[in-house]
Interface confidence: low
Amino acid sequence: FPTSLSDCQTPTGWNCSGYDDRENDLFLCDTNTCKFDGECLRIGDTVTCVCQFKCNNDYVPVCGSNGESYQNECYLRQAACKQQSEILVVSEGSCATDAGSGSGDGVHEGSGETSQKETSTCDICQFGAECDEDAEDVWCVCNIDCSQTNFNPLCASDGKSYDNACQIKEASCQKQEKIEVMSLGRCQDNTTTTTKSEDGHYARTDYAENANKLEESAREHHIPCPEHYNGFCMHGKCEHSINMQEPSCRCDAGYTGQHCEKKDYSVLYVVPGPVRFQYV
C-alpha cells in the first residue's frame, strides 16, 4: 500500500486506483490531496492529481530552487506540481553560476547597483525592460546582454529571423511589444536540421551528433565516481579521470555547467503543436 500520493505517480499524474478509501482517507479529494496547485479528479475509486497549467509562452525565464531554468514562472509551478515537490523562484533570469552576469532579466540583475524603483510609473515597463525614472523621456531601459548566447537561429512572430532566443527577447524589450519564437531556424529558409526524438521533442541533430562523439571519447578515459560523490552531478553522470583529482560531470543532453546544473539553451527543445513552443 502506498504511504503517499507520490507512490502512485504516473507520467501524466498520480493514479491510486484499487484502494479502499474508507480504510485510508488519504485518497479522498480534499484540499490536501493535490499539493502545488494540482487538480484532484475522483473517478469511481480512482483519485488522480492532474497538472494541466495553461501557461503562456512569454519568455520571462526564472531560476528554480532545484537549479533548473524555466521559460516563465508558470512552467516552474507546473514542474512543481508534476514532481509534487516545492520549487521556489530563486532568481529572475535563467540559472547561472555567475549570478552577476547581468542578463537583464531582473530589476537587480547584474552588478546590483541599480536602485529599486518604488512608484507605479515603472508598471509601464514590460518584456524584461528595467525602469529608469532618472531618464528625462524614456523610462524603460533594455539592459539585455546577448553576447554570451550561443547561435541558434529562430524565426519570430514579427516575421524576422534572430540568431537566438535572447535576441528575440531583446527585440521584444526594445520595441515593448510581444515577440515570440515561431519556429526553429531562420524564417522561410529553415536551415537548421531537426530530428524528432522518442519523446516527441525536436532537437538539433548537429548538437546530438557532436554530443555522442564527445561521449564516446570521454568514456575511454573516465571511470565511475566513488559512491560518496552521489548527487555531484545534477543532470548527468559523474566520472573520475585518472589524471584529475576532482571528478567531472558528463551532462545529459540539454544541460551544461560544472555540475550539469544549468539548462543549455544552445539546444532548443520544442514541443510540437500549433505555434506552442516551450523550453523544457
Partner: antibody
Framework: DVQLQESGPGLVKPSQSLSLTCSVT?????????WSWIRQFPGNKLEWMGF???????KYNPSLKNRISITRDTSENQFFLNLRSVTTEDTATYYC?????????????WGQGTSVTVSS | DIVMTQSQKFMSTSVGDSVSITCKAS??????VAWYRQKPGQSPKLLIY???NRHTGVPDRFTGSGSGTDFTLTINNMQSEDLADYFC?????????FGGGTKLEIK
C-alpha cells in the same frame, strides 16, 4: 524612502499570545514584495518566522506553523504577527522586513526591531 | 530544513586587511544566498544577494562568491565600521534559514 516600524508589548506572560504590528511607510504592501517577520534570540541566532505576500498569501516556518499567523490591514498599510501559546523560549528581538524583489527573498529593508520578553 | 553553517564564530582582523567569511549549506541552494551585516544595537543590513550581487549602496570592497553549498563573503581593505556580526541566509527552500553568524573583531 521605505521604512518599517515594529510595535507591540515588550512583556508577555507565558501561554498568552504575542501580537506585534509592522507599520510600513513609503511603499504600499499590496503593490509588491514579501513582508516577513524574523526574530533574533539572545545569543544572536536569527529565525525566519514567515511572510505575507503582496497578494495576501502566507508562508510560515513549519516549526511555528500551529502557533503563528501573519495578517495585514491594507488600509493602514500594516501587517501583523500573532504568536500563540508563548513560552520563555519565544523571548527575542522581533524584526519585520521586506523581501528584496520578486524571485529573491533576501531582505533589503528591516525595521529597527522590538524586544519581547516572555516572563510571568 | 537546510542548515547554514558558519564555522568561524569569531574572526580577528586588522584595519586594511582582507578577510573571508565562509558559509556552508547542508544541501544545494544554487545561488540563493544573502549576506547581512549587523552592528551592535542595529538591525541586519543586506550586503549581498543571489550569492554575488552587491546590494545598492554597498561598497565594492564587499564581494560574495560561491554556488551550490559553499559560499564566501570577502571584505577587502577592512574598515573599523566593518567590525560587526555577519550572517548568511539561504532562500532556496522553505523555511528560509540563517547561519549562526561570524563576529569580526580587531586583533
Amino acid at each position: 524612502d521605505v521604512q518599517l516600524q515594529e510595535s507591540g508589548p515588550g512583556l508577555v506572560k507565558p501561554s498568552q499570545s504575542l501580537s506585534l504590528t509592522c507599520s510600513v511607510t513609503g511603499y504600499s504592501i499590496t503593490s509588491g514584495y514579501y513582508w516577513s517577520w524574523i526574530r533574533q534570540f539572545p545569543g544572536n541566532k536569527l529565525e525566519w518566522m514567515g511572510f505575507i505576500s503582496y497578494d495576501g498569501s502566507n508562508k510560515y516556518n513549519p516549526s511555528l506553523k500551529n502557533r503563528i499567523s501573519i495578517t495585514r490591514d491594507t488600509s493602514e498599510n500594516q501587517f501583523f504577527l500573532n504568536l500563540r501559546s508563548v513560552t520563555t523560549e519565544d523571548t527575542a528581538t522581533y524584526y519585520c522586513a521586506r523581501g528584496l524583489r520578486r524571485g529573491d527573498y533576501s531582505m533589503d529593508y528591516w525595521g529597527q526591531g522590538t524586544s519581547v520578553t516572555v516572563s510571568s | 530544513d537546510i542548515v547554514m553553517t558558519q564555522s568561524q564564530k569569531f574572526m580577528s582582523t586588522s584595519v586594511g586587511d582582507s578577510v573571508s567569511i565562509t558559509c556552508k549549506a547542508s544541501q544545494n541552494v544554487v545561488t540563493a544566498v544573502a549576506w547581512y551585516r549587523q552592528k551592535p544595537g542595529q538591525s541586519p543590513k543586506l550586503l549581498i544577494y543571489s550569492a554575488s550581487n552587491r546590494h545598492t549602496g554597498v561598497p565594492d570592497r564587499f564581494t560574495g562568491s560561491g554556488s551550490g553549498t559553499d559560499f564566501t563573503l570577502t571584505i577587502n581593505n577592512m574598515q573599523s565600521e566593518d567590525l560587526a556580526d555577519y550572517f548568511c541566509q539561504q532562500y532556496s527552500s522553505y523555511p528560509f534559514t540563517f547561519g549562526g553568524g561570524t563576529k569580526l573583531e580587531i586583533k
